[in-house]
Amino acid sequence: KLLQVSTIAMQQQEKLIQQERALLNFTEWKRSCALQMKYCQAFMQNSLSSAHNSSPCPNNWIQNRESCYYVSEIWSIWHTSQENCLKEGSTLLQIESKEEMDFITGSLRKIKGSYDYWVGLSQDGHSGRWLWQDGSSPSPGLLPAERSQSANQVCGYVKSNSLLSSNCSTWKYFICEKYALRSSV
């Protein structure tokens, strides 16, 4: 009888250790998500929808660090480009640093050469300030080099290694950006 109780106690202790391990793993996962909240949602979405897909970017997208980029093969006006990206679960490119700008311009040189590509930058009609599509301001080094003479709405685009501005209703290629999915392995 005592041996039976002892065995049960050992089994319960083993279960408790396993649960503690699981809790520790979960706590660690939670902490890493809190540290990288920005990418955590994308990671969870990946786990939900494509548990076996280990690729951080979809087919035909280019990866750099935590981002995936899609260079369009069609022309459209800025607003339609914005919608096209959204349909694919992305937004027009938002350039956060010179390093990212260099990567983009370098990639474009390899892919297509010197064309115009809409990015998610547009000028506020009232203040004339440049803003990214989420409402944030670009860093001083990432402002379009020339002010468009257009009386219409003005949007930003990349050409060669420069950020320029143009009437939003002109037709250009465009670049979409989404967060790269982190491997669940």
Partner: nanobody, 116 residues
Framework: QVQLQESGGGLVQAGGSLRLSCAAS????????MAWYREAPGKQRELVAG???????TYANSVRGRFTVSRDIAKSTAYLQMNTLKPEDTAVYYC??????????WGQGTQVTVSS
């Protein structure tokens, strides 16, 4: 098949606020994105704001700084908080969802009227 139901529209004075909700029949965390569009009489339907599966946000230039898009994955609901409303914001507001194959699904729409 994704079903979407908007609510929260109504009549408001210029300068006022409204909050639109869009309840989805699926887990919105599995969608490519959700978006709000609007259609004013005699005008084309236009994108107002959108939020991607990864949480990226985009706004139309005309509403940036006044409108805020958000979502609650647990409730499978997207929201559009509209502040400092103007008469030109008067329109039928539609919620849209794009699934993994970029197929669009639309709600029935909710009327927003801003009086001066």
């Amino acid at each position: 098949q994704v079903q979407l139901q908007e609510s929260g529209g109504g009549l408001v004075q210029a300068g006022g606020s409204l909050r639109l909700s869009c309840a989805a029949s699926v887990n919105i965390g599995t969608l490519n994105s959700m978006a709000w569009y609007r259609e004013a009489p005699g005008k084309q339907r236009e994108l107002v704001a959108g939020i991607t599966g990864g949480g990226q946000i985009t706004y139309a230039n005309s509403v940036r700084g006044r409108f805020t898009v958000s979502r609650d994955i647990a409730k499978s609901t997207a929201y559009l908080q509209m502040n400092t409303l103007k008469p030109e914001d008067t329109a039928v507001y539609y919620c849209a969802a794009y699934d993994r194959s970029a197929t669009p699904y639309w709600g029935q729409g909710t009327q927003v009227t801003v009086s001066s």
